[in-house]
């Protein structure tokens, strides 16, 4: 069990545990003190106790020494009296810290005492070598406990100067490979640095004396180190592996390393010395093996072979834990070590070697664990772990402590909680205790909840209820026990509306540069926080302050100016402080394809067949099918800037074979294209330029007409540049007259016209044109008919006859023309005809020509749209290209037909009964007019049927109508008559209904002068004519609201003028009906001073 | 008259990378793609890729994808060459050339950019 | 890749004589093939394209033959500033590729 933070008021006493301790070696320098440390924590206090290899020492019995008054610390420091006081303190030491509870144990520190470093007394003697032989100088300095470092150097303290042939090795000894003459020394000085004394000894200086010789002798290489062909070395894991091998040879030997049983790790392999040196950092179990070394020159070489075995000191692979356990639990420390040779592994408890302890005891060990089952306040303890091997010792410490504490629950008490139907809720209830105490819960009625299956406990005391229902709300209560109290708590769960979407955002496939809206609607808990937000592909989207990309408002989302990047999931999030709920939409961006990223040109050498292959690369399709690729080119010199289609080719496929024109210079570029259009072209294609050939086509629209009667313009449409097929092109035109058989005329011209001078009118020639370039003529061309120009018609078409047929259409006819007589091709008649007049009177108007242009096939013609009862004028001529004829002249007249449509139809109520009609004759007579037609009938179902009148006067312009129903509205429709019938009818709708009920004064004002006001308004259009009262009213203090006597208007008269009027001043203006009133209004008098004139053209009465 | 003029002799080490120049004058630059080809110590030409001064595009040879950039700037009528993770075996002189109108032909060369890489 | 083999390697001819240079291509490349003449410490020279086509400015005593694979540059009268190396390449298809180079020299 571990103790909460949150169970307080409870003092829980704590085993010993070791804080800080000396390291496992100690070495102390002549001048130094000697420092040991334990500290250790603890409840209650900490006593310490130390041991030095093995038996109980006591410290503060020693002379010298120093204890450190201190709770926590049984450490303490030894200062000498003498050099070598150290020395009689060497030893193992270990520390003990115990309490009521146990003992905790530090690792052991070993003392060493290291003397003030001395080189022992010694002759050295002159080395006498002969020059190119090998030597090495010795150093052997004196053993150190700690590291030290040696340096050659000469009587100036100038280091001796080391490369592939002089080298210090590991040892310090001095090795030269080969000796020069310029080695030739007396003071070559071994230097050892002590680092922890700080302080630097030197051997006696060696002379080394080089004899000169003439002739140096190459000999192959020697190992000067190691000496053997092989040696066996233990590398331990972790740490650096160092590997050494100095030869002697002349010419001087260089070192190769070598791995036969692997790859040499180069991450973690450095060469130093000239090579001579290999390091290998952090030795790992895969560096067991063999390492070569092999010194070579020009005579040989020499190998070691060193044989690593990787070892390695104990280390954890799961360390014991402390830990702290209720009664009846069972207690398990692990102590699982690995190291090679495989650790020997002790177990102590409170110090103790389990073996020196009574058999009786609750524990076992089994496989690397030690074990207590059902353990009490008394198995209390602190036990000791250690693994040794001969590369090291590990020891952890680690305690069994056996609480036993009274039933607490560490949730506050009347907590609420609030979750949404549906959902999970979890109720709180952490209890803690030693034993671990037993948490239940009840509902209100102290009835245990777990009959629902949809509540479960959990092992750390919270209940789970899910599917949660709207009567779940309520009161819960926790019990948690154990065997030494028990205490409840209530929880209050308050169950809310889930929030749902209810209309989520719909996914959709939209066009690039277009916007697309999502909405989403929610319904959320009335007294819940509710919030909509929108997520782009996982990422929070939000209106950007510097950019109208992304619009949000009331559940709507708008993307403006979508782009393919813009393509993913969308989804509407609807949360509450309780839940969060997502409706997912996809959005596919398409449009017209992406840009072909690549273009090539293969297939050169059918540019001699002008032909070329072009591949390209798939352009992005954007969520449609490429439906075909576009090829087009230009021609930079031709026509820059200018691309024409060379064809194109399934969406499948990315190469295709391009038939060409020679002598084009093509530059290539492909489109994609879909249904949304075509996408960006690729980048343009190398120019490629198709040999020159003769030309493979002629001109075509070859024509010969005159422009003028004695010669003949021969044209044709000039071939287009890209069939040239060379760099130029010129034309070889060749005629004669048709059929005579003859021999050709012909000119080479480069314009695209000939003119052919002096021929006779209007003669038919053969004609062929050619195109020719460098290389050759184009194709035999075809004979084309032209003619020599021509001359006006002198043919006059004779008229066969007119016929009528109907007021306003005739059917012209004549003969055709002698063809002879034409001049030049017949092209068609021209046919002009105007009106002269009407039959009833002649009109001096402007008079406005009307044309028929009529195909030479033709020899009639129908003129329609004719005024009736009219005369016409009529000329018909014959056309060519030059121009018209003479022409064949006619008049004809139209027969009556039925008028047009009289003007302005009014209806003017008389009296709740009748009403006067009146109107304008049409404008278009037709014939003559004999009278009007006048039909009426009621517009609701339930009236009489339609009544007519014939109104025999043509002069008559108003008519009455009486009898009519004040109830109902009715259509009225009038028609003028001729001969040939009624015309076209004029409708209007009305009745006595509307009009003759109250009054309606329309659009009424009323304007004044100094001493007069004039009132108008508008009469309806129909309203029957009544009489009414206007009264005007003069307003204010002085004034008396004196009134003038009320007048007697007609509503007909649109206007009434009231004289006698005060100057200045406001008058109110009623108007009554039958004694109602009906309408006011106000008016104010200008003041004195101006002319005291009515406007003119009102009426008064 | 057309000139092609490219930069002087480099010496560079293993891994590191060149970049030649290629001035063009006497014509205009645009309407010519420049192509680039070198010639290593007593061996014969090897094309590298070009370069369209007008869009830019520029295409190489499988051999040297990755490797090399070849680059352009119209306001200088200037060409560039880079080639990227020198090894020994790049050692060459590399040329300009423009390429002839209508065909993939090397009509005017530039003098030649001795490189070598060298550690 | 088309590969273009040149042979032989190098000639010497003296002045007057007629000298053949022949280059083979791996493939069929009709006869889009140009030859460069690349004279010491200077740069390549075009002298013939599309297999028989001599560049303007080349000597007539010059001339190329061939197509689909197997070309042929005659120099018909060898004179001394025709000392140079020769090369073929073809421009059917990419990558372009040159032949080894023939070396001309003077006996």
């Known amino acids: 069990i571990q103790i909460p933070e949150e169970y307080e008021g409870h003092h829980v006493m704590e085993p010993p545990v070791i804080t800080e301790q000396s390291p496992r070696r100690l070495v102390v320098f002549p001048t130094d003190d000697i420092s040991l440390k334990c500290e250790a924590s603890g409840k209650p206090e900490v006593q310490f106790r130390w041991t030095r290899d093995g038996v109980h020492f006591k410290p503060k019995e020693e002379l010298g020494v120093t204890v450190y008054q201190s709770p926590h610390s049984g450490s303490f420091t030894i200062t000498g009296n003498n050099s070598n006081f150290a020395q009689r303190f060497q030893g193992i030491y270990r520390c003990f810290a115990s309490n009521k509870l146990g003992t905790a144990m530090s690792h052991e520190i070993r003392l060493m005492a290291e003397g003030a470093p001395k080189w022992p007394k010694e002759t050295v003697k002159p080395v006498e070598v002969e020059e190119g032989e090998s030597v090495v100088l010795p150093c052997n300095p004196p053993p150190s406990a700690e590291p030290l470092r040696i340096y050659w150097m000469n009587s100036k303290i100038l280091h001796i100067k080391q490369d592939e042939r002089v080298t210090m090795g590991q040892n310090g000894n001095l090795y030269f490979a080969n000796v020069l003459t310029s080695d030739n020394h007396s003071d070559y000085i071994c230097h050892a640095h002590f680092p922890g004394t700080r302080t630097i000894i030197q051997k006696e200086p060696i002379d080394l004396r080089v004899k000169a010789t003439n002739s140096m002798i190459d000999r192959k290489p020697r190992l000067l180190f190691p000496t053997n062909s092989s040696s066996h070395l233990v590398a331990l894991q972790g740490q650096p592996l160092v590997l050494e091998c100095i030869a002697e040879g002349f010419p001087t030997p260089t070192i190769k390393w070598l791995r036969p049983s692997g790859p040499m790790p180069a991450d973690r392999v450095t060469y130093q010395n000239h090579n001579k040196t290999l390091q290998l950092l952090k030795v790992g179990e895969e560096d067991d093996g063999e390492y070569r070394c092999l010194a070579e020159n020009s005579l040989g070489s020499a190998r070691h072979a060193y044989y690593v075995t990787v070892e390695a000191a104990p280390y954890w692979l799961h360390k014991p834990q402390s830990h702290l356990y209720g009664p009846g639990e069972t207690a398990r420390l692990d102590c699982q070590v690995q190291g090679r040779p495989q650790p020997e592994v002790t177990w102590r408890i409170n110090g103790i070697p389990v073996e020196e302890l009574a058999k009786d005891q609750k524990y076992r060990i089994q496989r690397g664990a030690l074990i207590l089952s059902n353990v009490q306040p008394s198995d209390t303890m602190v036990t000791q772990c250690e693994a040794r091997n001969r590369h090291g010792l590990l020891l952890a410490n680690a305690y069994i402590y056996v609480v036993q504490l009274p039933a607490k629950i560490l949730t506050a008490d009347n907590q609420t909680y609030m979750a949404v139907q549906g959902s999970t809720a979890y109720l709180l209830c952490k209890a803690f205790g030693a034993p671990v105490p037993s948490v239940q819960w009840l509902d209100e009625d102290g009835t245990t909840v777990l009959q629902d299956e949809r509540f479960f406990p959990y092992a750390n005391g919270t209940l789970g209820i899910r599917d949660l229902q709207a009567n779940d709300t309520g009161r819960y209560f926790c019990l948690a026990a154990n065997d030494q109290n028990n205490v409840t708590i209530m929880a209050n769960l308050k169950v809310k509306d889930a929030t749902q979407i209810t209309q989520g955002p719909r996914s959709t496939i939209e066009k690039k540069g277009s916007r697309v809206t999502f909405t989403c609607q929610a319904s959320f808990d009335p007294s819940l926080q509710p919030s909509i937000t929108w997520r782009g592909d996982g990422r929070d989207l939000q209106e950007l302050g510097d950019s109208d990309k992304y619009f949000i408002e009331d559940g709507r989302l708008v993307i403006h100016s979508l782009d393919y990047s813009d393509q993913g999931n969308y989804s509407c999030v609807a949360s509450t402080e309780l839940d969060v709920v997502e409706s997912r939409a996809q959005l596919l961006v398409v449009g017209s394809p992406g840009p072909v990223p690549r273009l090539v040109l293969s297939d050169l050498h059918l540019l001699t067949q002008s032909q070329v292959r072009v591949s390209w690369s798939p352009a992005e399709d954007h969520n449609a099918p490429i439906e075909k690729y576009d090829i087009e080119f230009e021609d930079k010199e031709m026509a820059p800037e200018k691309w024409y289609s060379l064809g194109k080719v399934p969406g499948n496929q990315t190469s295709t074979t391009l038939k060409l024109s020679p002598y084009v210079h093509y530059t290539f570029r492909v489109t994609a294209i879909n249904k949304y259009g075509p996408g960006e072209p690729s980048p343009v294609s190398e120019t490629v330029v198709t040999p020159e050939a003769a030309p493979e086509k002629n001109p075509v629209d070859v024509k010969g007409e005159g422009n003028e009667t004695t010669n003949m313009v021969i044209t044709w449409k000039p071939l287009r540049w890209m069939d040239w097929n060379a760099p130029q092109v010129q034309y070889r035109v060749q005629w004669r007259p048709q059929g005579t058989r003859g021999p050709w005329q012909e000119q080479i011209v480069s314009d695209p016209f000939l003119v052919v001078s002096n021929t006779s009118t209007f003669v038919p020639y053969e004609i062929k044109v050619q195109a020719v370039n460098s290389q050759g003529k184009g194709p035999e061309p075809q004979v084309t008919i032209g003619y020599s120009g021509e001359d006006y018609p002198q043919a006059i078409p004779e008229l066969e006859g007119i016929e009528i047929l109907n007021s306003s259409a005739v059917l012209v006819k004549w003969r055709p023309v002698d063809l002879a007589q034409v001049k030049g091709h017949l092209r068609g008649y021209n046919v002009t005809y105007w009106r002269e007049g009407s039959q009833r009177k002649h009109s001096k108007r402007h008079i406005h020509k009307d044309h028929v242009v009529v195909p030479a096939n033709t020899t009639s013609v129908i003129l329609s749209g004719l005024r009736p009862y009219s005369s016409y004028h009529l000329e018909v001529q014959a056309f060519n290209g030059r121009g018209s004829g003479p022409a064949s002249e006619f008049t004809f007249s139209t027969p009556e037909g039925v008028p047009g449509h009289p003007e302005a139809l009014h209806l003017e109520c008389q009296s709740n009964t009748s009403l006067l009609l009146r109107w304008q004759p049409p404008l278009s007579h037709n014939g003559v007019l004999t009278g009007y037609v006048l039909s009426y009938h009621p517009l609701d179902e339930g009236g009489k049927g339609q009544l007519s009148f014939n109104l025999r006067d043509p002069e008559l312009r108003t008519h009455n109508l009486t009898d009519l129903s004040p109830h109902l509205r009715y259509r009225f429709q009038l028609q003028a008559t001729t001969k040939e019938g009624p015309g076209e009818a004029i409708v209007r709708e009305g009745g006595t209904m509307a009009l003759s009920g109250i009054s309606d004064f329309g659009n009424i004002s009323a304007t004044a002068g100094e001493n007069y006001s004039v009132v108008s308004w508008v009469p309806k259009e129909g309203q029957c004519n009544f009489r009414f009262h206007i009264l005007f009213k003069a307003l204010g203090e002085e004034k008396g609201g004196a009134s003038l006597s009320p007048q007697y208007v007609s509503y007909n008269q649109s206007s009434y003028t009231q004289w006698d009027l005060q100057p200045d001043t406001d008058y109110e203006i009623h108007l009554f009906k039958e004694r109602m009133f009906r309408h006011q209004m106000a008016v104010k008098t200008n003041g004195t001073g101006r002319v005291r004139l009515p406007p003119a053209g009102f009426a008064t009465e | 008259q057309v000139q092609l003029v490219q930069s002087g002799a480099e010496v560079k080490k293993p891994g590191s990378s060149v970049k030649v120049s290629c001035k063009a004058s006497?014509?205009?630059?645009?309407?010519?793609?420049i192509q680039w080809v070198r010639q290593a110590p007593g061996q014969g030409l090897e094309w590298m890729g070009y370069?369209?001064?007008?869009?830019?595009?520029?295409d190489y040879a499988q051999k040297f994808q990755g490797r090399v950039t070849i680059t352009a700037d119209e306001s200088t009528s200037t060409a560039y060459m880079e080639l990227s993770s020198l090894r020994s075996e790049d050692t060459a002189v590399y040329y300009c050339?423009?390429?002839?109108?209508?065909?993939?032909?090397?009509?005017?060369w530039g003098q030649g950019t001795t490189v070598t890489v060298s550690s | 890749d088309i590969q273009m083999t040149q042979s032989p390697s190098s000639l010497s001819a003296s002045v007057g004589d007629r000298v053949t240079i022949t280059c083979r291509a791996s493939q069929d490349v009709g006869t889009a093939v140009a030859w460069y003449q690349q004279k010491p410490g200077k740069v390549p020279k075009l002298l013939i394209y599309w297999a028989s086509t001599l560049h303007s400015g080349v000597p007539s005593r010059f001339s190329g033959s061939g197509s689909g694979t197997d070309f042929t540059l005659t120099i018909s009268s060898l004179q001394p500033e025709d000392v140079a190396t020769y090369f073929c390449q073809q421009y059917s298809n990419y990558p372009l590729t040159f032949g080894g180079g023939t070396k001309v020299e003077i006996k």
């Open positions: 050339a423009r390429r002839q109108f209508g065909l993939p032909l090397f009509d005017y």
């Open positions: 370069i369209n001064p007008s869009t830019y595009y520029s």
């Open positions: 006497g014509y205009t630059f645009t309407n010519y793609w």
